[in-house]
Interface confidence: medium
Amino acid sequence: MMTGTIETTGNISAEKGGSIILQCHLSSTTAQVTQVNWEQQDQLLAICNADLGWHISPSFKDRVAPGPGLGLTLQSLTVNDTGEYFCIYHTYPDGTYTGRIFLEVLESSVAEHGARFQIP
C-alpha cells in the first residue's frame, strides 16, 4: 500500500531572467527512493538515479542545474518556462509518487517567490 505523500513548493512565481528552485519532499513512507525524474509537461528535464547520479537532458543543459538535494534549479527564466513541472519519485517497494509545481514567469519585478525548503 502506498502511504507516502509528496510536499512541493506549490504554485510559485519568478521574474524573467531570474532563477528558481523546484523542490519536492517525499514523506510518510519507509520506501527508498531509487530515482527522481523532473519533467515539464511531457518533456524530461533531468534524472537523479541512485547509482548513476544526475543526468540533465541535453536541450536543458545550459539552463538547468541539479540540486540542492533532489531538487532542480531553473536559470535564465523566460516567459515560455511558465507551466507545470512534475517531480516523479521512483521508490521501492511502493512504486511511483508524483508531485506537481506550477511556475509562472513574470515580466515585472513584483514576482513573489513561493516558500522554499531544503530536503533535510
Epitope: 527508498q32 531509487t34 547520479g53 541539479p66 538535494g69 517497494p93
Partner: antibody, heavy 119, light 107 residues
Framework: QIQLVQSGPELKKPGETVKISCKAS????????MGWVKQAPGKGLKWMGW????????TYADDFKGRFAFSLESSASTAYLQINNLKNEDTATYFC????????????WGQGTTLTVSS | DIQMTQSPASLSASVGETVTITCRAS??????LAWYQQKQGKSPQLLVY???TLAEGVPSRFSGSGSGTQFSLKINSLQPEDFGSYYC?????????FGGGTTLEIK
C-alpha cells in the same frame, strides 16, 4: 536517539573470511540506505558502497567488487559487511554509516570495527 | 570517477584563529559536497552538506561555501575541540569519493 553499533575488533589470517555487523536503532531501518567506509591505518576515508535496506540491492565501488558483500537482516535492523579471502591490505577500520538520499553522504556513523589481517 | 583534492594536507593554527580548508573536484559537482570532522580514534561526524548547509547541532563558527569544482570549509575562532582531521566528499554520483583529508593541529 539514533545509534549504529558495530561488532568488535577482528584478528584474521590471510585467506579467511570476516563478517562485520552494524545494528541500527532509533529510526526506521528501511527508510535509509546503509553505507560502508574503509579507513586504513593512518590513511583517509574510502567509500566502499551502500545497500538499499528495503530492496537489499547493493552497490559497490570498483575497488570493492568481488571479495566484498553487503547484506541485511532487516528484522533485526542490522547490516553486514563480509570480506572473503582476506588479504593483508584489508587491515583497516570499517565504518557503517546511515546514508541520506541514495547512501551518498552520511549523517550517523558506527563506532568502527578494526580488522587486522596478519599471518 | 570524480577525484576530490583537498588542500592543505595539514596545517597548524592557534585557538581563536580562523582557518580555511579547500577541496577541488575533478569535474563539476554543482553543490553536491559534504564536509566531515574526524577526531583521533573516533568516527567521522557530518558538518556540512549541499556545500553550505550546516548539519544539525554543528556550531555556527563552521561554514561551507563553493559550487562547481571549488569548495571551502571555514572555521572561525578555532576552539580546542576543532582540532582533528577534515574530509570533503562529493555526493553527486556514484562512487561518492572522499578527499584525502586535512589534519588541523594546534600550534
Amino acid at each position: 536517539q539514533i545509534q549504529l553499533v558495530q561488532s568488535g575488533p577482528e584478528l584474521k589470517k590471510p585467506g579467511e573470511t570476516v563478517k562485520i555487523s552494524c545494528k541500527a536503532s532509533g529510526y526506521t531501518f528501511t527508510a535509509y540506505g546503509m553505507g560502508w567506509v574503509k579507513q586504513a591505518p593512518g590513511k583517509g576515508l574510502k567509500w566502499m558502497g551502500w545497500i538499499n535496506t528495503y530492496s537489499g540491492v547493493p552497490t559497490y565501488a570498483d575497488d570493492f567488487k568481488g571479495r566484498f558483500a553487503f547484506s541485511l537482516e532487516s528484522s533485526a535492523s542490522t547490516a553486514y559487511l563480509q570480506i572473503n579471502n582476506l588479504k593483508n591490505e584489508d587491515t583497516a577500520t570499517y565504518f557503517c554509516a546511515r546514508g541520506i538520499y541514495f547512501g551518498n553522504y552520511f549523517d550517523y556513523w558506527g563506532q568502527g570495527t578494526t580488522l587486522t589481517v596478519s599471518s | 570517477d570524480i577525484q576530490m583534492t583537498q588542500s592543505p594536507a595539514s596545517l597548524s593554527a592557534s585557538v581563536g584563529e580562523t582557518v580555511t580548508i579547500t577541496c577541488r573536484a575533478s569535474e563539476i559537482i554543482y553543490t553536491f559536497l559534504a564536509w566531515y570532522q574526524q577526531k583521533q580514534g573516533k568516527s567521522p561526524q557530518l558538518l556540512v552538506y549541499n556545500a553550505n548547509t550546516l548539519a544539525e547541532g554543528v556550531p555556527s563558527r563552521f561554514s561551507g561555501s563553493g559550487s562547481g569544482t571549488q569548495f571551502s570549509l571555514k572555521i572561525n575562532s578555532l576552539q580546542p575541540e576543532d582540532f582533528g582531521s577534515y574530509y570533503c566528499q562529493h555526493h553527486y554520483g556514484s562512487p561518492y569519493t572522499f578527499g584525502g583529508g586535512t589534519t588541523l593541529e594546534i600550534k
